[in-house]
């Protein structure tokens, strides 16, 4: 698979709008840094079906960044 | 209804040269990532190149490096794959995909694809 590039999000494009629940492992938040300058969600799926991309600005997506938040804060 | 269709496969002798199409209705490509697979006889299928509508970055197989070219047109809403020098090893049914929210990791993985087309068969002989 491709590396990482500088500059370069883990994300292509704008993500989905929804994940069922059901089907979440785990929930990451990548903060704006040098290598990308939007906030990221990134889905981990469960029984290995890989990972998937949530549009940050998606009501799926506030919701998990609200609660990721409270719970490091 | 969303749909892929594949065109463009056939005979082709080593060292030859073939362009896929894959033609995409029913959703455009905008957001999406576009792959091609490949699957042989009795093998998996396997991630052979993608490419993205948002920024145009596109992804490729080590074994198909500097042989095979992914490109799109967004106004036809169709994505092409040129293969060249084009090996008996190729030979498999290519299949393209769309995935949504896919992550550059995982552009050659058949998990980040929802919609697939019905495939085209490659053959490479002599």
């Known amino acids: 698979f491709p590396m990482f590039k500088r500059g370069r999000c883990l994300c292509i494009g704008p993500g989905v709008k929804a994940v069922k629940v059901a089907d979440i492992e785990k929930a990451s938040i990548m903060y704006p840094s040098n290598n990308c300058d939007k906030i990221e969600v990134i889905i981990t799926l469960k029984e290995n079906k890989g990972q998937r991309c949530l549009n940050p600005k998606s009501k799926q997506a506030r919701l998990i960044i609200k609660k990721v938040e409270r719970k490091n804060f | 209804e969303v749909q892929l269709v594949e065109s463009g496969g056939g005979l082709v002798q080593p060292g030859g040269s073939l362009r896929l199409s894959c033609a995409a209705s029913g959703f455009t490509l905008d957001d999406y990532v576009i792959g091609w697979f490949r699957q042989a006889p009795g093998k998996e299928r396997e991630g052979v190149s993608g490419?993205?509508?948002?920024?145009?970055?596109?992804y490729y197989a080590d074994s198909v490096k500097g042989r095979f070219t992914i490109s799109r047109d967004n106004a036809k809403n169709t994505v092409y794959l040129q293969m060249n020098s084009l090996k008996p090893e190729d030979t498999a049914v290519y299949y393209c995909?769309?995935?949504?929210?896919?992550?550059?990791?995982?552009?050659?993985?058949?998990?980040?694809?929802?919609?697939w087309g019905q495939g085209t068969q490659v053959t490479v002989s002599s």
């Open positions: 490419i993205s509508s948002s920024d145009g970055s596109t």
């Open positions: 995909a769309a995935g949504m929210g896919v992550l550059r990791l995982w552009v050659l993985s058949k998990l980040s694809y929802d919609y």
